[in-house]
Interface confidence: medium
């Protein structure tokens, strides 16, 4: 069954290559395990950036992913992707799966276009 | 059934002849044994470079291969090939098989072109 996932349409990464955005879903039935996956869409190709499972006790996610972090509260996940460079500019989709207990629900946001601008290199000091 | 395997299109080996790249797959259904094979394509010939089976308990792979190493996390394998020389420049494909339990899924990435530049020999010191 499907759930509605919302995320901002555009986010500009900081000069340090960090982009943060919320991913919210509804309806939020009582769920013990929520799996959140961040996917990047390039052309017709979808690649997984990072994924994690949140629980009532485990509200900090993506511990195994150096470039992703996230916190979970009720039906909202605050996502942060770091280490971004200009080549990483693209559409990032948030997928939410209400894993357990049944029934299983899944939903995908329309995507957040993340723009990344590489900083100019510092001039050599004389 | 097929799964989608993604890997970067180009990677430049370090001056020490080491190339690292991720190999990711989706969808990732609950799988206890994931077999990852690295193949090199030269002309129409495909040769196996190394292969390993990852499990939930065994997340470090290619222990029998001196030139390959890899770590496995959820649906991502971080591959490292070392000992590369300029003659090893070529297209390296990542093949993923979700081995067990059934149903079996298999997928092959489009390949990562690894460029290897042999280092310039250091000038003799006088």
């Amino acid at each position: 069954e499907a759930i509605q996932v919302t995320q901002p349409s555009v986010v500009l990464a900081s000069s340090h290559g960090v982009a943060s955005f919320p991913c919210e879903y509804s309806p939020s039935h009582n769920t013990d395990e929520v799996r959140v996956t961040v996917l990047r869409q390039t052309n017709d190709q979808m690649t997984e950036v990072c994924a994690t499972t949140f629980t009532e006790k485990n509200t900090v996610g993506f511990l195994d992913y150096p470039f992703c972090s996230g916190t979970f509260n009720e039906s909202r996940v605050n996502l942060t992707i770091q280490g971004l460079r200009a080549v990483d500019t693209g559409l990032y989709l948030c997928k939410v799966e209400l894993m357990y207990p049944p029934p299983y629900f899944v939903g995908m946001g329309n995507g957040t276009q993340i723009y990344v601008i590489d900083p100019e290199p510092c001039p050599d000091s004389d | 059934e097929a799964i989608q395997v993604t890997q970067p299109s180009v990677v430049l080996a370090s001056s020490h002849g080491v190339a690292s790249f991720p190999c990711e797959y989706s969808p990732s259904h609950n799988t206890d044994e994931v077999r990852v094979t690295v193949l090199r394509q030269t002309n129409d010939q495909m040769t196996e470079v190394c292969a390993t089976t990852f499990t939930e308990k065994n997340t470090v792979g290619f222990l029998d291969y001196p030139f390959c190493s890899g770590t496995f996390n959820e649906s991502r394998v971080n591959l490292t090939i070392q000992g590369l020389r300029a003659v090893d420049t070529g297209l390296y494909l990542c093949k993923v098989e979700l081995m067990y339990p059934p149903p079996y899924f298999v997928g092959m990435g489009n390949g990562t072109q690894i460029y290897v530049i042999d280092p310039e020999p250091c000038p003799d010191s006088d």
Partner: antibody, heavy 124, light 107 residues
């Protein structure tokens, strides 16, 4: 000749323990998923447990979960089933079976080689 | 868990008869179904795998068909050595489950 030979069955009191073994020969044991299937006297077949090639994945029927442990020693070509807290309803012939995976792009699995079975009787 | 329901539970037929056994799954299992033969006092033997594929060395009078939830096992011409109990088994998901069995006897 491809063969599976079970051993370790016998009479045990309720609450007791037993360890079944299954010795494999004639094939590369480590290349196969292995299963235990049981059959109570005069009844049908009941799948009990499975273990993947290296032991990374183990599976159990709800009726034995938490009481039975499947394991394997590939160096000895042997499959094991450690049975604890045995109950009268565990009385059965226990078969070990080889799981053959078939198909190219989609696996199926079938028990293509079976042992002769070993009888476990749980009774006071 | 997926329940497998076999029918009939027993049947009696004459040598040369066509014998049909059905197996119904409680949910769609695609073609993830096997058929086994078990003779008295013996271990089961694989006859049909993946719903319709004949195991090597098994006589061609045995066949299987079906997909989804409804499956059929057929012996085209019953022979005296076919006296046995036949079981279907799903491998769509764990726990793996068998049908309750069909006992085939000769009239």
């Amino acid at each position: 000749e491809v063969q599976l030979v079970e051993s370790g069955g016998g009479l045990v009191q309720p609450g007791g323990s037993l360890r079944l073994s299954c010795a494999a020969s004639g094939f590369t044991f480590s290349s196969y998923v292995m299963h235990w299937v049981r059959q109570a006297p005069g009844k049908g077949l009941e799948w009990v447990s499975a273990i993947t090639w290296s032991g990374g994945g183990t599976y159990y029927a709800d009726s034995v979960k938490g009481r039975f442990t499947i394991s394997r020693d590939n160096s000895k070509n042997t499959l094991y089933l450690q049975m604890n807290s045995l109950r009268a309803e565990d009385t059965a012939v226990y078969y070990c079976a080889r799981g053959r995976l078939f198909g190219l792009v989609r696996y199926g699995e079938a028990f293509d080689v079976w042992g002769q079975g070993t009888l476990v009787t749980v009774s006071s | 868990d997926i329940q497998m329901t076999q029918s009939p539970s027993s049947l009696s037929a004459s040598v040369g008869d066509r014998v049909t056994i059905t197996c119904q799954a409680s949910k769609d299992i695609s073609n993830y179904l096997n058929w086994y033969q078990q003779k008295p006092g013996k271990a089961p033997k694989l006859l049909i795998y993946d719903a319709s594929n004949l195991e090597t060395g098994v006589p061609s009078r045995f066949s299987g068909s079906g997909s989804g939830t409804d499956f059929t096992f057929t012996i085209s011409s019953l022979q005296p050595e076919d006296i046995a109990t036949y079981y279907c088994q799903q491998f769509n998901s764990f726990p793996l489950t068998f049908g309750q069995g069909t006992k085939v006897e000769i009239k």
